[in-house]
């Protein structure tokens, strides 16, 4: 946002919220009055966009119009003019300026020569009071180019190509009050260039190439109130009194420069400074006395710098400060008494700062604080006396609930129930199935156990959501740092990784057997068990490594309320970022690619085999069934993993990802595989359907026999268990011939296709 638009915004909204009520109503800590009625509501219900009081009082005075905006009209009521195309509002429509260049517009004593391809300052009659020369081709301001314009009050020179300004360029402009030089190519201002501008109040030099300034640069600017030097390339401020020649300076905006440090003497003469904006610089060091002379300072913005340490007493002299922004600095530690002296502070921004030693003591002395901004909404619990605390959600959790969305709060139970029930059902069915392939069964049980852990993870998250219902913010920080959160997070990663690795293993086995049938070696019991154990060990290692080294991984699982490390934040340790990327874009992406490629190859291989078959129509039908089944396996994998890969990849590119994404991924996307694996790999297979069919048949038979008083015996059912979605037609179900899918290689090509339908 340009300063122009910021000022324009403040101009419109500066006085928006003016009435405060309920000062006499006393509420307990963390609660705030509903205007002049006796009702009190907790912090989290104030300024949340909902009329909870019933009289709209909880949504009044929510705008943070602290700092300069309260006094804005006094000095800058017409600032917006600088950005308008026609900056003038003359009372008389007819032109009163004598000679006017043909392409210019004129109203009263005001001249508008915007976008007229001027290469030099035009010569007009000396009674002109405002001159706009924006968007022209002026490169130089030579000596005395405005010398005759003694009545000129406003001069607009934005968006030219000015590189050079003569020391005597502005000579004679004794009445000038506003000078706009923004969006030019000025690299240096010679000391004394503004010497004649003793009535100048606003000097705007935004978006130029200024690399240095010194006190004499501003010599002569005795009346200057506003100095905007935004978006230049200043690397340092002078170690001399900057305001020496600007005794009335109120507003100094140095945003978007390259300033490295602030010196003790810089502001020694700036005793009238009310607003100091130094955001988006490279300040890495502050001296204890840097701001000591600024005893009238109302707003200090140091956001988006490189400040690591705040001297304990740096704010001790800022008794009038009402707005302080320290956001997005790599501040390592904030002293408990850091803000003790800021008795009039109303707005404090600490966004993007990890406050490891946060405590209520830090903010308790700030009795007038009405707005506070943190990196994490969980920090709001440490400032219970502040009415408006942002953020009030991280997209996952809110001040009230671990899961902010009602949909998530309901579906966490639904999804966990489906996941757990499906997987437990498959596990429990094993005793009733006389499987000819114990090794495959073992793999499937392993898969179901892993997927079941995902259901348990969601149950735990749902449980804690219930436990913290309505007051999550009180427990948020402790919950995210707790062993419970670490363990439940590692459980989710364990489930994810084991499931992914198992699916890859099962897919590769199948791939080798089908694509290279004659190379297929039947895996032995020992090999299968070894692979399964290795997969589980790998899962445990991947999941629990982050818990073993807090120094390296920081709070790896506790970056959000659902304890799932999906996307890394800027402040997360580099180790944690690399680790997270290695899992999601390393192991899991590789596994996903292998699975997609394998199923594609398998289908192609079977399709090639089918070409030689005689019963074309029958083959096509079977091929379609096969294609459909394969597609669903790959599709559910893609549905689950592609969003996760995209989120991870975007976070790697520093794209800001809304917190909301994580919770939707964790509750709806991540469990897709866990919930559908039992269905895809067991419940929809022909052997399982036949088993259910036989159970049902036996049950009906028994019922009818029982009614006739006869005793029946159910026939033993042999489930020749094949790979997922890969069932044998009845004519091929010969136990002695097919005990393992690899042995399908003995069948003719056309029979191979049959075996999939």
């Amino acid at each position: 946002m340009t300063s122009g638009s910021v000022f324009f915004y403040i101009l419109i909204f500066g006085k928006y919220f003016s009435h405060g009520g309920g000062q006499d109503v006393k509420c307990s800590l963390g609660y705030f009055p509903c205007g002049n009625i006796t009702k009190c509501l907790p912090q989290l219900l104030h300024c949340n966009g909902v009329d909870d009081c019933g009289n709209q009082a909880d949504e009044d005075n929510c705008g943070d119009n602290n700092g300069w905006s309260l006094q804005f009209d006094k000095y800058f009521a017409s600032y917006y003019k600088m950005t308008s195309q026609y900056p003038f509002e003359a009372e008389t429509p007819e032109c009163l300026v004598g000679s006017v260049p043909v392409q210019c517009l004129c109203q009263g004593l005001e001249l508008d020569c915007d976008e007229t391809n001027l290469r030099a300052v035009p010569s007009v009659s000396s009674n002109v009071t405002a001159m706009s020369l924006q968007w022209n081709l002026i490169r130089k301001l030579p000596p005395d180019c405005f010398k005759n314009y003694h009545d000129l009050q406003k001069l607009y020179l934005q968006n030219n190509k000015i590189t050079s300004i003569s020391i005597y360029a502005f000579r004679g402009l004794n009445s000038l009050t506003k000078l706009y030089l923004s969006h030019n190519r000025i690299t240096f201002l010679k000391p004394g260039v503004f010497e004649d501008l003793h009535r100048l109040e606003w000097l705007i030099i935004e978006d130029n190439h200024l690399s240095r300034i010194s006190p004499p640069t501003f010599y002569g600017l005795n009346s200057l109130i506003l100095l905007v030097l935004m978006n230049n390339v200043l690397t340092r401020l002078p170690d001399k009194p900057l305001c020496q020649h600007m005794p009335r300076l109120h507003w100094l905006d140095l945003e978007g420069n390259h300033i490295h440090n602030l010196r003790n003497l810089t502001f020694i003469s700036c005793s009238n400074l009310t607003v100091l904006v130094m955001r988006k610089n490279k300040i890495n060091h502050l001296n204890e006395n840097t701001f000591a002379p600024l005893q009238k300072l109302d707003e200090l913005d140091l956001g988006s710098n490189k400040i690591e340490n705040l001297p304990p007493l740096i704010f001790k002299d800022l008794k009038e400060l009402s707005q302080l922004n320290l956001s997005y600095n790599p501040i390592q530690k904030i002293q408990a008494n850091q803000f003790d002296y800021l008795v009039k502070l109303k707005s404090l921004s600490l966004e993007g700062i990890e406050i490891s030693n946060i405590q209520q003591r830090m903010f308790r002395p700030l009795m007038n604080l009405s707005h506070i901004y943190f990196k994490k909404f969980q920090y709001c619990g440490y400032a219970p006396h502040v009415r408006s605390c942002k953020p009030n959600t991280d997209g996952i959790s809110s001040l009230e609930n671990l899961l902010a969305s009602i949909i998530q709060r309901v579906f966490v139970w639904v999804v966990s129930a489906v996941t757990c029930f499906g997987n437990i059902f498959v596990i429990c069915m094993r005793p009733y199935i006389r499987s000819e392939n114990k090794l495959y069964a073992m793999s499937i049980i392993s898969l179901c156990c892993a997927d079941c852990l995902m259901g348990i993870y969601l149950f735990v998250i749902g449980g804690f959501d219930l436990k913290f219902r309505g007051e999550y913010n009180k427990h948020a920080q402790l919950w995210m740092e707790s062993t419970h959160c670490q363990l439940v997070g590692s459980l989710a990663i364990l489930s994810t990784e084991v499931s992914v690795l198992l699916l890859t293993f099962l897919t590769l086995e199948k791939y080798i057997c089908i694509v290279y049938p004659f190379r297929c070696v039947r895996p032995g019991k020992c090999r299968t068990i070894t692979v399964l154990i290795l997969i589980w060990i790998t899962g445990f290692i991947v999941a629990f490594i982050p818990l073993s080294n807090k120094e390296f991984f920081k709070n790896y699982y506790g970056t959000n309320g659902v304890c799932f490390p999906l996307h890394s934040e800027d402040t997360e340790s580099i180790g944690a970022q690399i680790y997270s990327v290695a899992i999601f874009l390393g192991i899991n992406l590789a596994a996903f690619i292998i699975i997609v490629f394998s199923y594609g190859s398998m289908f192609y291989s079977v399709h090639q085999s089918a070409i030689t078959a005689t019963e074309i129509r029958n083959q096509v039908k079977k091929e379609m069934i096969l294609a459909k089944r394969f597609f669903f396996i790959v599709f559910t994998d893609a549905l689950c993993w592609i969003p996760i890969f995209v989120v991870k990849f975007l976070s790697l590119l520093q794209v800001e990802i809304p917190g909301t994404i994580t919770s939707w991924v964790v509750i709806f996307i991540l469990p897709i595989n866990s919930a559908l694996n039992p269905i895809l790999y067991t419940l929809t297979t022909r052997p399982f359907k036949e088993m259910i069919h036989r159970f049902w048949y036996n049950y009906r038979q028994r019922k009818s026999m029982d009614s006739k008083g006869q005793k029946t015996y159910a026939p033993s059912f042999i489930w020749v268990e094949m790979w997922p979605l890969q069932e044998m037609p009845p004519e091929l179900m010969k136990p002695d011939l097919f005990t393992y899918p690899c042995e399908m290689s003995l069948i003719s090509q056309s029979t191979r296709l049959n075996s999939y339908s």
Partner: antibody
Framework: QVQLQQPGPELVRPGASVTLSCKAS????????MNWVKQRPGQGLEWIGM????????ILNQKFKDKATLTVDKSSSTASMQLSSPTSEDSAVYYC???????????WGQGTTLTVSS | DVVMTQAPLSLPVSLGDQASISCRSS???????????LHWYLQKPGQSPKLLIY???NRFSGVPDRFSGSGSGTDFTLKISRVEAEDLGVYFC??????????FGSGTKLEIK
């Protein structure tokens, strides 16, 4: 400390242009104006002109606009003044002097005595 | 151009005496910003000029406090309260209110009586 070093006496034939130099040290050369001042024997001081090393902006006394050409070399922190077609009238001591604001000259060189003679 | 007139041209004094040099300009030296840009220089024999006083009454760094400047508009004075041997030389006044060009007075020679 601030120093403005000017070379010793120069002897030049009438009509043959001459360049006088002034090497600055001890301060930021590009932040100050460099002025040139002429003093004829036993007479007062006469301001010739000034140049700003940052962008070579030159302000000349109208009286010397056809006589003097001012230049700077930022790499060597040296200011120079070329006098074209010198005559005996140009025989004088030439001083370089710096100023931050175009007001007063806080440091001066020791001067170069130019003699124009055949 | 602004003409600066100094008086006297020569000022013989005894060491320890007070000396007073006058400078008059052909037009007011009060700048539109309120400042008056009148300065004093001393050129000792065989040396280059040195700044003594700037903007009527401000002593340059290292200048002894026996030197003082005063005046306004068109009339200005430099006073030396107790003349010392090292003070001997030619004193020039100069203006920078109406520039270019900077103009100097013709000089006042301070010498031992």
């Amino acid at each position: 400390q601030v120093q403005l070093q000017q070379p010793g006496p120069e002897l030049v034939r009438p009509g043959a242009s001459v360049t006088l130099s002034c090497k600055a040290s001890g301060y930021s050369f590009t932040s100050y104006w460099m002025n040139w001042v002429k003093q004829r024997p036993g007479q007062g001081l006469e301001w010739i002109g000034m140049i700003h090393p940052s962008d070579s902006e030159t302000i000349l006394n109208q009286k010397f606009k056809d006589k003097a050409t001012l230049t700077v070399d930022k790499s060597s922190s040296t200011a120079s003044m070329q006098l074209s077609s010198p005559t005996s009238e140009d025989s004088a001591v030439y001083y370089c002097a710096r100023c931050l604001l175009p007001h007063y000259f806080d440091y001066w060189g020791q001067g170069t005595t130019l003699t124009v003679s055949s | 151009d602004v003409v600066m007139t100094q008086a006297p041209l020569s000022l013989p004094v005894s060491l320890g005496d007070q000396a007073s040099i006058s400078c008059r300009s052909s037009q007011s030296l009060v700048h539109s910003n309120g400042n008056t840009y009148l300065h004093w220089y001393l050129q000792k024999p065989g040396q280059s000029p040195k700044l003594l006083i700037y903007k009527v009454s401000n002593r340059f760094s290292g200048v002894p406090d026996r030197f003082s400047g005063s005046g306004s508009g068109t009339d200005f004075t430099l006073k030396i309260s107790r003349v010392e041997a090292e003070d001997l030389g030619v004193y020039f006044c100069s203006q920078s209110t109406h520039v270019p060009p900077f103009t100097f007075g013709s000089g006042t020679k301070l010498e031992i009586k």
